[in-house]
Interface confidence: low
């Protein structure tokens, strides 16, 4: 009779993480008598996966009933596969011996490759807000995928970005891999509603890539523009001066009126109006009693936006020596000065 051969018909098996791997093995003869063992790897450091004779292997089940006397099918199933299970598995026949069984013949081995999906990409932006025309960096990370081949793209509002750098780690062989990418984005005044998207495509994601997003509203600061104007008022001795605060983001803003350098009133932006681009407008007004002033009055609208240094805009009220001539048309003149 021919000597027993251990046949592992599959050189390689490809399994998705979480699935069950079937490793096939048959013997060509019932003799010599003795158990089968499965190992991962070869040599002295090999790892025991299944022992027909003894032991507890909760993730392993046999394909056929190994207690049957005439059984020659020693295939096993390993459940809930993870990338850590990748490797070459050997089906080894032992000959019954005393006191220990002796290794008789090994199969050629089956390489188990595990396909694992990347984790959802996490996009993070800069810690501090930046103003339009500045370049900011976003990072994107995804982990736990296998094989190593992966594609990462960056988009801003659907437009693909080209200024980014990507690394896949580790460089050598590993059970699973991680990707890290940094993209540079130039901010514009219209970016409050913008989104940066990191898109990861992998062989395990045939249907759709995974996406991570970051809203530029969390990154951008659009400083306000100020305009101080004088409004006509019916009352002869009163002038209404308004400060228009336009196109700012985020909403956090405090405004202070100064009369000749002295604080007249401070208020916080509350009932703002929102522009289409996501920025805000706000208006504050000051009623000035001209008859209470003997000299010209310098009115300053000072705005502190989102904790930044204050910006201001001033307006000069000319106080005439003849109160009756102080109509709304002649009472003031806007100098248009813009001070910091």
């Amino acid at each position: 009779e021919e000597e027993l051969q251990v046949i592992q018909p599959d050189k390689s098996v490809l399994v998705a993480a979480g699935e069950t791997a079937t490793l096939r093995c048959t013997a060509t003869s019932l003799i010599p008598v003795g158990p089968i063992q499965w190992f991962r790897g070869a040599g002295p450091g090999r790892e025991l996966i299944y022992n027909q004779k003894e032991g507890h292997f909760p993730r392993v089940t046999t394909v056929s009933d190994l207690t049957k006397r005439n059984n020659m099918d020693f295939s096993i199933r390993i459940g809930n596969i993870t990338p850590a299970d990748a490797g070459t598995y050997y089906c080894v026949k032992f000959r019954k011996g005393s006191p220990d069984d002796v290794e008789f013949k090994s199969g050629a081995g089956t390489e188990l490759s595990v396909r694992a999906k990347p984790s959802a990409p996490v996009v993070s932006g800069p810690a501090a807000r930046a103003t339009p025309q500045h370049t900011v960096s976003f990072t994107c990370e995804s982990h736990g995928f296998s094989p190593r081949d992966i594609t990462l793209k960056w988009f801003k509002n659907g437009n693909e970005l080209s200024d980014f750098q990507t690394n896949v780690d580790p460089v050598g062989e590993s059970v699973s891999y991680s990707i890290h990418s940094t993209a540079k984005v130039v901010l514009t005044r219209e970016d409050v509603h913008s989104q940066v998207i990191c898109e990861v495509a992998h062989v395990t994601l045939q249907g759709d890539p995974l996406r991570g997003t970051a809203n530029l509203s969390e990154t951008i600061r659009v400083p306000p523009t100020l305009e101080v104007t004088q409004q006509p008022v019916r009352a002869e001795n009163q002038v209404n001066v308004t400060c228009q605060v336009r196109k700012f983001y985020p909403q956090r803003l405090q405004l202070t009126w100064l009369e000749n350098g002295n604080v007249s009133r401070t208020e916080t932006a509350s009932t703002v109006t929102e522009n289409k681009d996501g920025t805000y407008n706000w208006m504050s007004w000051l009623l000035v009693n001209v008859s209470a002033h003997r000299d010209d009055v310098k009115l300053t609208c000072q705005v502190e936006h989102d904790g930044q240094p204050a910006v201001s805009k001033s307006h000069d009220l000319k106080v005439s020596a003849h109160p009756k001539e102080q109509g709304s048309n002649t009472a003031a003149e806007n100098t248009g000065s813009n001070e910091r």
């Epitope: 659907g158 249907g207 759709d208």
Partner: antibody
Framework: QIQLVQSGSELKKPGASVKVSCRAR????????MNWVRQAPGQGLEWMGF????????TYAQGFKGRFVFSLDTSVSTAYLQIGSLKAEDTAVYYC????????????????WGQGTLVTVSS | DIQMTQSPSSLSASVGDRVTITCRAS??????LAWYQQKPGKSPKALIF???YRYIGVPSRFSGSGSGTDFTLTISNLQPEDFATYYC?????????FGQGTKLEIK
């Protein structure tokens, strides 16, 4: 030459089930996702969903959850569509169509289609 | 779901004509749009992907344009074999959706 070859027409009674096959020729089945598209008589095209041919993971469109099952046998390069508890309104031509898979340049466009399988449900 | 609306539903033309079929998406699909041709009793055939690119073997008289929500398929110098039903399809968002079709008939 790339081809998707589907099984022949089927006549079934209401309540029965049917299994339509789609064999990939000229390319490796597991390199492309396989979609299923329904076309009722005289009607337009309706996407039923797809199966990830690498992992065997199916994704079903909203109206096709429950009675419809996508499966694979990679050893014979074949994708399957099984419909259970057939109804008269399931009468249609069923197409398999491949897509490149994840968003590539032509992402979810169906570049090759099977010839279609007519499933008629009638008592 | 993204609705795809084609117009017209049908049109008649003669050999040698130039025809335009439009497809409107209910929301922005970028350039993730394809066009297909289907003849009676046959499976659809892919013509255009990514809104503007012809598949290999598709004659140059077929051209696509558009992005966002509005797209067109233009067939210049109509040939007898071009009379068929044409479908647009978006693949920007799941579920993938098709237009209702435009039937091009001989005048």
């Amino acid at each position: 030459q790339i081809q998707l070859v589907q099984s022949g027409s089927e006549l079934k009674k209401p309540g029965a089930s049917v299994k339509v096959s789609c064999r990939a020729r000229g390319y490796t089945l597991t390199d492309y996702a396989m979609n299923w598209v329904r076309q009722a008589p005289g009607q337009g095209l309706e996407w039923m969903g797809f199966i990830n041919t690498y992992t065997g993971e199916p994704t079903y469109a909203q109206g096709f959850k429950g009675r419809f099952v996508f499966s694979l046998d990679t050893s014979v390069s074949t994708a399957y569509l099984q419909i259970g508890s057939l109804k008269a309104e399931d009468t249609a031509v069923y197409y398999c169509a491949r897509t490149r898979g994840y968003y590539d340049f032509d992402g979810g466009a169906f570049d090759y289609w099977g010839q279609g399988t007519l499933v008629t449900v009638s008592s | 779901d993204i609705q795809m609306t084609q117009s017209p539903s049908s049109l008649s033309a003669s050999v040698g004509d130039r025809v335009t079929i439009t497809c409107r998406a209910s929301q922005n699909v970028g350039t993730h749009l394809a066009w297909y041709q289907q003849k009676p009793g046959k499976s659809p055939k892919a013509l255009i992907f990514s809104a503007i690119y012809r598949y290999i073997g598709v004659p140059s008289r077929f051209s696509g344009s558009g992005s966002g929500t509005d797209f067109t398929l233009t067939i210049s110098n109509l040939q007898p074999e071009d009379f068929a039903t044409y479908y647009c399809q978006q693949y920007n968002t799941y579920p993938l959706t098709f237009g209702q079709g435009t039937k091009l008939e001989i005048k």
